[in-house]
């Protein structure tokens, strides 16, 4: 079992319903919205998390929309279609039959079309650049200490191997975290960089997805690291296909 057995909860995803109805009375957790069983020893896929987020009652929602700066999805939140593994389906459509193609992190990568739009494959996002600006501090953080702390965070909290943290750049007050993960490099059981980036983004915004875990308290040598602005850029293995009209807008 991977859920917390004693009180049957999902430590890695609070947007679940858990009950001891698994094999041998083991705790089993299902994501809200999709009802899909999730592995609570690792991160839940972004697609299932977005679906759960959209299914939450509007009046009880404790999670807020991304800020105007977030480049996760310029189109804002949507209720995605997920495949049986919890990944985004390559083609997403809304209730008014407007469709578009997305990448593996669910970000639109084509112009919007109608139901005839074809999305042949789910294109993998293999490079994510997380751009942070921290609040003013007495002095700059030591670069190697900052690098070590961020790698520890991604390893221990998000279970992302440091080999997928390609680099940590720092020019006060800007921190850039580069996540890279080619299809060939990602082994079974490896956390996807898109899922790790999403959990990190939500943690930074004070909207932690973890069950009963304190909010993110980032410290470098005891000094609090408080983020005041986040931008996330996605690079796909195949470049996106937008019309020139959008590119020149």
């Amino acid at each position: 079992h991977t859920a917390a057995q004693d009180n049957c909860t999902c430590p890695t995803n609070k947007m679940t319903v858990c009950s001891p109805d698994g094999p041998g009375g083991r705790c089993q957790c299902r994501a809200l919205g999709s009802g899909m069983a999730v592995d609570c020893s690792t991160l839940t896929s972004k697609c299932l998390l977005l679906k759960a987020r959209m299914s939450a009652p509007k009046n009880a929602r404790t999670l807020v929309r991304p800020s105007e700066h977030a480049l996760v999805d310029n189109d804002g939140l949507y209720d995605p279609d997920c495949d049986p593994e919890g990944r985004f389906k390559a083609r997403q459509c809304n209730q008014t039959s407007v469709c578009w193609c997305v990448n593996s992190v669910g970000v639109r990568r084509t112009d919007k079309g109608d139901l005839s739009l074809r999305c042949d494959e789910l294109v993998r996002t293999h490079h994510i650049l997380i751009d942070l600006r921290h609040r003013p501090t007495a002095g700059a953080f030591n670069h190697s200490d900052l690098d070590a702390e961020l790698r520890r965070l991604f390893r221990e909290r998000y279970r992302l191997h440091p080999k997928f943290v390609a680099a940590v750049h720092y020019e006060q007050p800007t921190i850039q975290i580069e996540l890279r993960q080619n299809t060939s490099q990602k082994a079974a059981g490896d956390v996807d960089i898109g899922d790790a980036a999403y959990y990190f983004e939500r943690d930074i915004k004070g909207e932690s997805l973890f069950q009963g875990r304190g909010g993110l308290d980032l410290r470098v040598r005891g000094e609090p690291l408080q983020v005041e602005r986040t931008l996330i850029y996605y690079l796909d293995e195949i470049p996106p296909k937008f019309s020139m009209k959008r590119l020149t807008a």
């Epitope: 690098d147 790698r151 680099a167 490099q185």
Partner: antibody, heavy 118, light 111 residues
Framework: QVQLQQSGAELVRPGVSVKISCKGS????????IHWVKQSHAKSLEWIGV????????TYNQKFKGKATMTVDKSSSTAYMELARLTSEDSAIYYC???????????WGQGTTLTVSS | DIVLTQSPASLAVSLGQRATISCRAS??????????MHWYQQKPGQPPKLLVY???NLESGIPARFSGSGSRTDFTLTINPVEADDVATYYC?????????FGGGTKLEIK
């Protein structure tokens, strides 16, 4: 400063089990997973597995599945490793350790010497 | 599992001379410019002590006579000049892939 304090040496009979401990101090215990490493004359250093101090779940080296069981007690900042059905091949020094930024072993316990003998 | 082959198994060097220890991995341990290879020193009765991380980065407090080099599958630890205090066993370790694995060790003695 970061310290990992391990339990004392053990002399046990073949076939029994033993549980060794590793108490962490000088850092936030749940911020770091605890790894266990075996050192024997025959096989140099071998990674046994890791337990998440926060989640409480363990990942084992295939070779030690069924031999080692790792647990953690957050309230006392202590990790435990139980070794079952002991044989002379389990005689070794067992270390607990914490990882650094690039998954090198940054901090080590002083080691627990296990001798299995009839 | 990634197998690390260290050579030589033992090494006798005169004080003030150079000691070179080699570690070969069964597959590449590099990822996006980072080599996930590390070196440790172990003295009798003590746990291993980190000397060099990521192939060539000297751990804080380690004397500059220790240096590491290499990439992909071939790595080297160099001690120059060797001092009496360097008598120990040296291990390489890869952390590119689970399970982490160690080399068989190289015992350094003074000639």
């Amino acid at each position: 400063q970061v310290q990992l304090q391990q339990s004392g040496a053990e002399l046990v009979r073949p076939g029994v089990s033993v549980k060794i401990s590793c108490k962490g101090s000088g850092y936030t215990f749940t911020d770091y997973s605890i790894h266990w490493v075996k050192q024997s004359h025959a096989k140099s250093l071998e990674w046994i597995g890791v337990i998440s101090s926060y989640y409480g779940d363990a990942t084992y080296n295939q070779k030690f599945k069924g031999k080692a069981t790792m647990t953690v007690d957050k309230s006392s900042s202590t990790a435990y490793m139980e070794l079952a059905r002991l044989t002379s091949e389990d005689s070794a020094i067992y270390y607990c350790a914490l990882l650094g930024a690039y998954n090198y072993f940054d901090y080590w316990g002083q080691g627990t010497t296990l001798t299995v003998s009839s | 599992d990634i197998v690390l082959t260290q050579s030589p198994a033992s090494l006798a060097v005169s004080l003030g001379q150079r000691a070179t220890i080699s570690c070969r991995a069964s597959e590449s341990v590099d990822s996006y410019g980072n080599s996930f290879m590390h070196w440790y020193q172990q003295k009798p009765g003590q746990p291993p002590k980190l000397l060099v991380y990521r192939a060539s980065n000297l751990e804080s407090g380690i004397p500059a006579r220790f240096s590491g080099s290499g990439s992909r599958t071939d790595f080297t630890l160099t001690i120059n000049p060797v001092e009496a205090d360097d008598v120990a066993t040296y291990y390489c370790q890869q952390s590119y892939e689970d399970p982490p694995t160690f080399g068989g060790g190289t015992k350094l003695e003074i000639k």
